[in-house]
């Protein structure tokens, strides 16, 4: 039993535990009652979203439109915010009742669909404190958490998970690959009060671990001892020259020698041509530079390893996960090729609820979406084949006409006679 029991004297302890779904963590005690839904947006009320979401006041920024795209599982349910202009920055945000995730789990979830076959563009969200001026949200606006997929060229196809810790944006040390196809995908970030995290794509875990291990929030636990240095007599040479080995007396021979078979040409005129010198050839007896044989070094101590000490700068922080204030969700993006659709935003404290919500939204329409896309692709293939056939037919017709123009006029004879005369149909 944990020390938690001391807090509850008398009967009904198990009932309390059960009813409140109390979970005990070493650093924190937190209650998980009804799921708290801090923010939820499915764009199911037509243009209603325009009153909830605020655009940055800048004319050259891209416009979001409400759309379910070129293909979908359910035309109404799959409506979301779609980027509509190429090579633009986008800045759009929605506020909610501010909350703190201290002592509880934080789940951030949304769907992204890059139906444009994206080449370079963001698909991530940022969670800001409520102090953000939404009309002036930009790339340098300080946020708490940034999460989601990002694609740019062949080199970047990743899920960003960035935490602002003590005023600094800290990037994850792992490479989490995002989906780069044209379908809708569900992205989930879970941050727990025991300083662990989980990233899910399509409700399946793709990464998990400890915040302290996978981000450089804190100085390292160990550092190289600054007072230690390699001793002067430390010998790192595994092999040395054999001191007893000596060069054979007949070793030194020139690399090149005059060709013994060469003869002075008969027409050589020393007055005109100078003194004749035979051409040089490689000396077959040349042995190269002599090197003494190698033996094991009796003084070899191995590679010197710098000893480590506890880092005096290091101190653990049990509240890395915690933020005092979340109040705005923002899309602050650049897209070369537009067409990305964002939908089914959810911020909650309940992992199970988020999973359920994902299954009821993305989960319900994903198969039908694929079906519609496959059908469109098939129709496109058929159209392409038809176009190719028509083109071929036109080309054959044109060739026939050309041949007729080129050939002499045909005599009016029967087919049989024509064939006998060697005329062939084009």
């Amino acid at each position: 039993s944990s020390s938690l029991e001391v807090l509850f004297q008398g009967p009904g302890l198990n009932d309390i535990f059960e009813a409140q779904k109390i979970e005990w963590h070493e650093e924190n005690l937190y209650f998980q009652g009804e799921p708290a839904v801090y923010f939820k947006e499915q764009f199911l009320d037509g243009d209603g979203w325009t009153s909830r979401w605020i655009e940055k006041h800048k004319s050259d920024f891209g416009k979001f439109v409400l759309s379910s795209g070129k293909f979908y599982g359910d035309e109404e349910k799959d409506k979301g915010l779609q980027t509509s202009q190429d090579a633009r920055f986008y800045a759009l945000s929605a506020s909610f009742e501010p909350f703190s995730n201290k002592g509880q789990t934080l789940v951030v979830q949304f769907t992204v669909k890059h139906e444009q076959n994206i080449d370079c563009g963001g698909g991530y969200v940022k969670l800001f404190p409520n102090s953000l001026d939404q009309t002036d949200m930009h790339g340098d606006s300080e946020y708490n958490i940034m999460f989601g997929p990002d694609i740019c060229g062949p080199g970047t196809k990743k899920v960003h998970v960035i935490f602002n810790y003590k005023g600094k944006n800290v990037l994850i040390n792992k490479d989490i690959r995002c989906k780069d196809d044209e379908f809708t995908h569900l992205y989930t970030l879970i941050v727990r009060p025991d300083n662990t995290y989980e990233v899910k794509i399509d409700n399946s875990q793709v990464e998990s671990g400890s915040l302290e291990d996978d981000w450089d929030f804190l100085p390292p636990k160990k550092i190289k001892d600054p007072d230690a240095s390699k001793p002067e007599d430390w010998d790192e040479r595994a092999k040395i020259d054999d001191p007893t080995d000596s060069k054979p007396e007949d070793w030194d021979k020139p690399e090149h020698i005059p060709d013994p078979d060469a003869k002075k040409p008969e027409d050589w005129d020393e007055e005109m041509d100078g003194e004749w010198e035979p051409p040089v050839i490689q000396n077959p007896e040349y042995k190269g530079e002599w090197k003494p044989r190698q033996i094991d070094n009796p003084d070899y101590k191995g590679t010197w390893i710098h000893p480590e000490i506890d880092n005096p700068e290091y101190s653990p922080d049990p509240s890395i996960y915690a933020y005092d204030n979340f109040g705005v969700l923002g899309l602050d993006l650049w897209q070369v090729k537009s067409g990305t659709i964002f939908d089914n935003f959810l911020i909650t404290n309940d992992e199970a609820y988020a999973e359920e919500f994902g299954n009821e939204t993305w989960g319900v329409t994903k198969a039908a979406e694929k079906q519609m896309k496959d059908k469109q692709d098939e129709e496109q293939r058929t159209r392409r084949m038809m176009r190719t056939k028509m083109r071929m037919r036109r080309m054959r017709r044109t060739r026939r006409k050309m041949r007729r123009k080129m050939s002499p006029a045909r005599p009016r004879t029967s087919c049989r006679e024509a064939c006998l005369q060697g005329w062939t149909e084009a």
């Epitope: 370079c120 990002d150 740019c152 080199g155 970047t156 990743k158 600094k168 990037l171 650049w334 070369v336």
Partner: antibody, heavy 127, light 107 residues
Framework: QVQLVQSGAEVKKPGSSVKVSCKAS????????ISWVRQAPGQGLEWMGG????????NYAQKFQGRVTITADESTSTAYMELSSLRSEDTAVYYC????????????????????WGQGTTVTVSS | SYELTQPPSVSVAPGKTARITCGGN??????VHWYQQKPGQAPVLVVY???KRPSGIPERFSGSNSGNTATLTISGTQAMDEADYYC?????????FGGGTKLTVLG
């Protein structure tokens, strides 16, 4: 990894302009930010400005605003830095340097440092 | 505008640990990068994002960043480490370099 090759040394008269080129090879030009950094004889490094070819717009240090123009030609994977109204104090080695973007936002290169540098172009301003 | 302050010179005996500091207002909130420059050569990135080493940079180079000071540490300093070292950060979309520190390896 990308390699950067700069144009040759230049000798210029005060009041004139100089245009230095920086050609990238061995990487995707659009996935880098290109910075221009200069170093006067015996002095430290000084950032002049930079450009992210995929975004097109350049960014300049306050000190050089209005006198420097940085451009990029994606078709030839070449970045250019033009400095006008030259004076003797502009005598320096001019370097181009690239930082990987590793993301679609223009701020990504902040995190990665200038990991590849050109060989430098010496510009001498003298009457 | 943001300023970075480095000591003009630092001396170290071979095999010992060299520390080069870079001071800036609340520098811990920024990503600090360090460059090494040898005479007549272009700078080389030795540490990025405070403490990460690019491939090919020896393990003896490390970095840290807290409060108002970032530090480049070279443990087991070698004669070949003698060079100028510059710290750099980004501030309001502008790159800022420190004035540079000349590292002398004695002996």
């Amino acid at each position: 990894q990308v390699q950067l090759v700069q144009s040759g040394a230049e000798v210029k008269k005060p009041g004139s302009s100089v245009k230095v080129s920086c050609k990238a090879s061995g990487g995707t030009f659009s996935s880098y930010a290109i910075s221009w950094v200069r170093q006067a004889p015996g002095q430290g490094l000084e950032w002049m400005g930079g450009i992210i070819p995929i975004f097109g717009t350049a960014n300049y240090a306050q000190k050089f605003q209005g006198r420097v123009t940085i451009t990029a030609d994606e078709s030839t994977s070449t970045a250019y830095m033009e400095l006008s109204s030259l004076r003797s104090e502009d005598t320096a080695v001019y370097y181009c340097a690239s930082s990987p973007l590793r993301g679609s936002g223009w701020y990504w290169h902040y995190y990665y440092g200038m990991d590849v540098w050109g060989q430098g172009t010496t510009v001498t301003v003298s009457s | 505008s943001y300023e970075l302050t480095q000591p003009p010179s630092v001396s170290v005996a071979p095999g010992k640990t060299a520390r080069i500091t870079c001071g800036g207002n609340n520098i811990r909130s920024k990503s600090v990068h360090w460059y090494q420059q040898k005479p007549g050569q272009a700078p080389v990135l030795v540490v990025y994002q405070d403490s990460k080493r690019p491939s090919g940079i020896p393990e003896r180079f490390s970095g840290s960043n807290s409060g108002n000071t970032a530090t480049l540490t070279i443990s087991g300093t070698q004669a070949m480490d003698e060079a100028d070292y510059y710290c750099q950060v980004w501030d309001s979309s502008t790159a800022v370099f420190g004035g540079g520190t000349k590292l002398t390896v004695l002996g």
